[in-house]
Interface confidence: low
């Protein structure tokens, strides 16, 4: 055993090299100098090295450093990125940017792994919050990592960053996630004009309040069936006919085909069948002509 | 070990005001955000209000919205709960919750004792 | 806002039951939904989050299914334990709602 150990004759590793290929587990053990192998990290990636082999290696960086990996090494770890745990990377400090791509290459079409999601909080947290660099990379990466957030940590993204952020980045976001975003994205686009602010702002507005969309109203933007259908129902209902009108502009027919579905069918039930009449759409289950309406929220806020 | 700890309750007329605190301990208290939820004598449970661990985002139940007023203090592990123009449908327990994520999903998972709020003339 | 609808809102039941306990969302919440048990004079404890994920030191007993509006609590064998108040909350937007609650009666 004692011999097996040691490094066989002319066999001591130089440098990072294709021969090391046919160096048995225990060989790479015995001959390869981890401080050397730190230095030259950047070539493992270029040789075809077995699963058995990269454990060793990670075996010699993990006995080298037992505190973490200094980022010069992880920036080149490559595959061997892969074999490392949850646990290994929370002993990292990740800083650069660079650092990060060169990470997510490696895990590339790949759904996000916990390592990914540890590398990620780790880099995150080491920035202070989500700045718009970060969030171009991780979105590019994963277009669904900004709705993988809890609302908590969507709280630290500055509105700067929310241009970096494309509609599919937002497809599986809910409401809670976009209560918090659509502030942010509102102060990040306020300097737009009217039609550019509506295409920037439109994947936002299921967290947009009843006044937001009252004054989009008044904008001719067309709003779309799907992203009406998305909005708050607490934001819909107090829109009158005309308001809703207005903002749907030539997609207002689209709300026939909606009109068992929420947002529209608790819509409906809140406008005066009479209103409704005048769209022309045959909608059905608003408050007959002649009832009294009263306004709960008000008479509460009276009493 | 994660406690939580009400204090503030009582009597108060209605019309009156009154302010709650929560004292939080075994727990780093600035990365979590909070709520409260009250419970009426023999009634179920209400929600009433959130906070993010840097106060950045608020909400209130409709029920107590433009009466009541959530904050923290993170460097007293405290949360606060100021209630004015209280009624008589406000007395209830109040319960301080830390509010725990799983991925994106909210639940509470740790809760106080509670404090009573008897609001009567 | 979302309505939390429980049912039944009491039951009667002995030791060794099969109890369910059924929450309906008023609008779809995908699986953002807890369960809570709670014994007079306490505060509530968590037993089920993300609709059946158990919580860490709650006995196996206990188990959660559902997805979108319907959603199920069930306890495979009632022991005196168990006998209690129990919630379900949805946490997909506020204002977060509770369901009325289902008291655990003792038969």
């Known amino acids: 055993e004692v011999e097996k150990t040691a490094c066989p004759s002319g066999k001591k590793a130089r440098e990072i090299d294709e021969s090391l290929i046919f160096y048995k587990k225990w060989e790479l053990e015995a001959c390869v100098d981890a401080a050397l192998l730190a230095t030259q990290m950047d070539r493992v990636n270029a040789i075809p090295f077995t699963y058995e082999q990269l454990d060793v290696l990670k075996h010699k960086l993990d006995e080298l450093y037992p505190q973490g990996y200094p980022e010069s090494v992880i920036q080149h770890l490559g595959y061997l990125f892969l074999k490392m745990s949850p646990e290994d990377i929370r002993k990292w400090n990740v800083t650069s940017l660079e650092t990060l791509k060169a990470l997510l290459e490696v895990n590339k079409g790949h759904e996000m792994s916990p390592q990914v999601a540890t590398l990620i909080d780790r880099f995150v947290k080491g920035r202070g919050q989500l700045d718009k660099d970060t969030l171009d990379t991780l979105t590019a990466f994963y277009p669904g990592y900004l709705c993988s957030l809890s609302p908590e940590e969507l709280s630290s993204v500055p509105p700067s960053s929310i241009w970096a952020v494309r509609p599919q980045d937002l497809d599986t976001c809910d409401p809670r996630q976009l209560d918090v975003l659509y502030p942010k994205a509102r102060l990040a686009f306020q300097n737009m004009n009217g039609s550019e602010y509506f295409v920037k702002i439109q994947s936002f507005l299921g967290g947009a309040p009843t006044e937001d969309l009252k004054a989009l109203s008044q904008q001719n933007v067309s709003m779309d069936l799907a992203t009406f259908m998305k909005l708050r129902t607490d934001a819909v209902l107090p829109l009158t006919v005309a308001e809703v009108q207005k903002l749907l502009g030539p997609h207002v027919e689209g709300l026939k085909a909606e009109e068992r579905h929420r947002p529209v069918r608790d819509w409906i039930l809140r406008q005066r069948q009479d209103d409704l009449d005048t769209l022309g759409l045959g909608l059905q289950g608003g408050i007959p002509n002649g009832y009294l309406v009263l306004d709960l929220s008000m008479q509460e806020a009276l009493s | 070990e994660v406690q939580l700890v009400e204090s503030g309750g009582g009597l108060v007329q209605p019309g009156g005001s009154l302010r709650l605190s929560c004292a939080a301990s075994?727990?780093?208290?600035?990365?979590?955000?909070m709520n409260w939820v009250r419970q009426a004598p023999g009634k179920g449970l209400e929600w009433v209000s959130y906070?993010?661990?840097?106060?950045?985002?608020?909400y209130y139940a409709d029920s107590v919205k433009g009466r009541f007023t959530i904050s923290r203090d993170n460097a007293k592990n405290s949360l606060y709960l100021q209630m004015n123009s209280l009624r008589a449908e406000d007395t209830a327990v109040y319960y301080c919750?830390?509010?725990?994520?799983?991925?994106?999903?909210?639940?509470?998972?740790?809760w106080g004792q509670g404090t009573l709020v008897t609001v009567s003339s | 806002d979302i309505q939390m609808t429980q049912s039944p809102s009491s039951l009667s039941a002995s030791v060794g039951d099969r109890v369910t306990i059924t929450c309906r969302a008023s609008?779809?919440?995908?699986?953002?939904l807890n369960w809570y048990q709670q014994k007079p004079g306490k505060a509530p404890k968590l037993l089920i989050y993300?609709?059946?994920s158990l919580q860490s030191g709650v006995p196996s007993r206990f188990s959660g299914s559902g997805s979108g509006t319907d959603f199920t609590l069930t306890i495979s064998s009632l022991q005196p334990e168990d006998f209690a108040t129990y919630y379900c909350?949805?946490?997909?937007?506020?204002?977060?709602?509770f369901g009325g609650g289902t008291k655990v009666e003792i038969k």
């Open positions: 919750a830390r509010e725990d994520f799983s991925h994106k999903l909210g639940y509470f998972q740790h």
């Open positions: 075994g727990f780093t208290f600035s990365s979590y955000s």
């Open positions: 906070i993010s661990s840097s106060s950045s985002t608020i």
């Open positions: 609008q779809s919440i995908s699986s953002y």
């Open positions: 993300a609709a059946s």
């Open positions: 909350q949805q946490s997909y937007s506020t204002p977060l709602t």
